[in-house]
């Protein structure tokens, strides 16, 4: 295309531009430290700062930490991106009762429909299970095993859930978590794409490089980069993604280059005190007892309310192991088990007393 030759020469004569043969046009050369937002930037506004991994560029052009979703009850919904925080949501089996910026501050277990009730609407990350009276024709053997779950003790749950007493009430802490979850996270994160860098179990082979093209020194094509576990906030600053390392938190969305990690309460818990992109305090979620029914919620993030089932309805199940399945956990976790493989060395909060469990592993007394 001979007609492109003069244009290319013009580019060469202009130090602020370069010629892109792929698109056969003159492109604006982003200043050092900024990266192009498109293949061939045309103007300075087509260039952006880049933060380090786990930080995002906020509205004020500052790199700000993405929230973390490392609490056991949170999972990552959307990753930390260059211009937005990671977003967390309650992990499967839980719903958010108290929202937080980019996360959930309070997750509770989905209610289990009691005897005589069946699931009308299954629980989601935002809404609790909605129960309704079982149809008269439903056999006592239960229409679904899901409707037979009862607390193993058969006791009526507390109207108000009790706090889980985490080691710290802050939503941005970094305690060690149980090894099982860490191992699962580590396994899942080793395959994460470069634009959603891992924050836990990362093999540390990728220091959080730009998800766009690599940038040779002096090329001017560097996008603003953040370190691992930082994201580029709206202000263009690298900001620390929140951590979800508390035992009662799970990661809802990972730390991405432009958004914080978000955390949510782990299954079986609900957020009592919200925090930005996380939850400051998780409490156990109450389970519907026999002879109660979950009242449908107008608000997506309210606690479950209970009322007596309509007259004439009979419990379909007995709260026994034969007919019902006990929930995995109906009580708050009172200690944090430190797994020896959670990190290269064991980071133990200086405020928490340490004891040794029967397995010989240190246990953080969160009480």
């Amino acid at each position: 295309f001979p007609q492109d030759r003069p244009f290319e020469d013009t580019c060469h004569g202009n130090p602020s531009h370069y010629y892109d043969k792929a698109v056969r046009r003159c492109c604006y050369r982003c200043p050092m430290g900024l990266f192009p937002t498109q293949q061939c930037p045309q103007r300075p506004t087509d260039c952006r700062k880049q933060c380090e991994p786990d930080y995002y560029l906020d509205e004020a052009d500052r790199c700000t930490a993405c929230v973390t979703c490392s609490r056991d009850d949170l999972v990552e919904k959307t990753p930390c991106a260059w211009n937005s925080s990671r977003v967390c949501e309650c992990r499967p089996g839980m719903f958010c009762s108290t929202s937080a910026v980019n996360s959930c501050a309070r997750c509770f277990f989905h209610s289990v429909c009691p005897a005589g009730m069946i699931v009308k609407f299954p629980g989601t990350a935002q809404k609790n299970t909605v129960c309704e009276p079982a149809s008269p024709g439903v056999s006592p053997a239960c229409a679904s095993p899901e409707n037979c779950k009862e607390p193993s003790s058969g006791t009526i749950p507390q109207a108000k859930p009790t706090p889980v007493s985490p080691a710290t009430s802050s939503a941005s802490t970094m305690p060690v978590r149980g090894g099982t979850r860490l191992a699962q996270e580590a396994a899942s994160k080793l395959t994460r794409a470069p634009d959603s860098p891992s924050s836990v179990g990362r093999p540390s082979s990728d220091p959080g490089l730009s998800p766009t093209q690599p940038c040779p020194e002096g090329s001017g094509d560097c996008r603003k980069q953040c370190e691992p576990d930082y994201y580029l906030d709206e202000a263009g600053r690298c900001t620390a993604c929140v951590s979800c390392s508390r035992d009662d938190l799970v990661e809802k969305t990972p730390c991405a280059w432009n958004s914080s990690r978000t955390c949510e309460c782990r299954p079986g818990m609900i957020c009592a005190t919200s925090a930005t992109n996380s939850c400051a305090r998780c409490v156990p979620y109450p389970i519907c007892a026999a002879e109660t029914v979950t009242k449908p919620q107008d608000m997506a993030e309210k606690d479950t309310t209970f009322e007596a089932p309509p007259l004439g309805t009979q419990p379909d199940c007995n709260p026994t192991p034969e007919n019902g399945e006990a929930p995995a956990s109906t009580s708050p976790t009172q200690s944090l088990l430190v797994d020896s493989q959670a990190s290269k060395t064991l980071p133990i909060p200086t405020s928490a007393p340490v004891a040794l469990s029967s397995t010989g592993k240190p246990v953080l007394d969160a009480g």
């Epitope: 050092m32 430290g33 490089l209 900001t239 929140v242």
Partner: antibody
């Protein structure tokens, strides 16, 4: 073990430039960013900027923008910090530092530091 | 930029004393704060990260607490080797910033 070894002291005149080196060993150089922090005599610490040795990309504190250039040579596992248009207030100990490989997250607090390079700017 | 104000700037104490240093951030930094100890002519050494987690090998007399904007470094029983300068650092938002330092001197 991780080591960061910096170049020796420098005496410079105002308006001149200085280039301080930081040789890394004990880990894969391209895996971690290298940060530079300075400390004027009797004062606190001030973050200058960092480089990603893998990509060559760097980021600087606005206070130094235009005067500082941080580079890295992968072949020698060495990072460099060059500060130009020196003034007397640039007299300080300059440190290179690396974040920890510790805990579950990779936040930028520094577990490894070079021994420091004293840069004196005086006419 | 986030400012970190450390207090006191100077502190005279005796061996065995309980010492508390505070660090106040100009805006919320979560728990993204580290504490360093620095002795004359030496590079800083990290003591605490994530506001309350002791770094490997740091004696348990050092503890950290706080979140949001107010942070504290406590030395439960001052030892002769603890006479040094202490700095806080926020790593929540870039640019990374440090406190002005607290010099702990022998009374």
């Amino acid at each position: 073990q991780v080591q960061l070894v910096q170049s020796g002291s420098e005496l410079k005149k105002p308006g001149a430039s200085v280039k301080v080196s930081c040789k890394a060993s004990g880990y894969t150089f391209t895996t971690y960013t290298i940060h530079w922090v300075r400390q004027p005599p009797g004062k606190g610490l001030e973050w200058i900027g960092y480089i990603n040795p893998s990509s060559g990309c760097s980021d600087y504190n606005q206070n130094f923008q235009g005067r500082v250039t941080i580079t890295a040579d992968k072949s020698t596992s060495t990072a460099y910090m060059e500060l130009s248009s020196l003034r007397s207030e640039d007299t300080a100990v300059y440190y290179c530092a690396r974040r920890a490989d510790y805990g579950n997250y990779e936040y930028t607090w520094f577990a490894y530091w070079g021994q420091g390079t004293t840069v004196t700017v005086s006419s | 930029d986030i400012q970190l104000t450390q207090s006191p700037s100077f502190l005279s104490a005796s061996v065995g004393d309980r010492v508390t240093v505070t660090c106040k951030a100009s805006q919320n930094v979560g728990t993204n704060v580290a504490w360093f100890q620095q002795k004359p002519g030496k590079a800083p050494k990290v003591l605490i990260y994530s506001a309350s987690y002791r770094y490997s090998g740091v004696p348990d007399r050092f503890s950290g607490s706080g979140s949001g904007t107010d942070f504290t470094l406590t030395i439960s029983s001052l030892q002769p080797e603890d006479f040094a300068e202490y700095f806080c650092q926020q790593y929540h938002t870039y640019p990374l910033t440090f406190g002005g330092g607290t010099k702990v001197e022998i009374k």
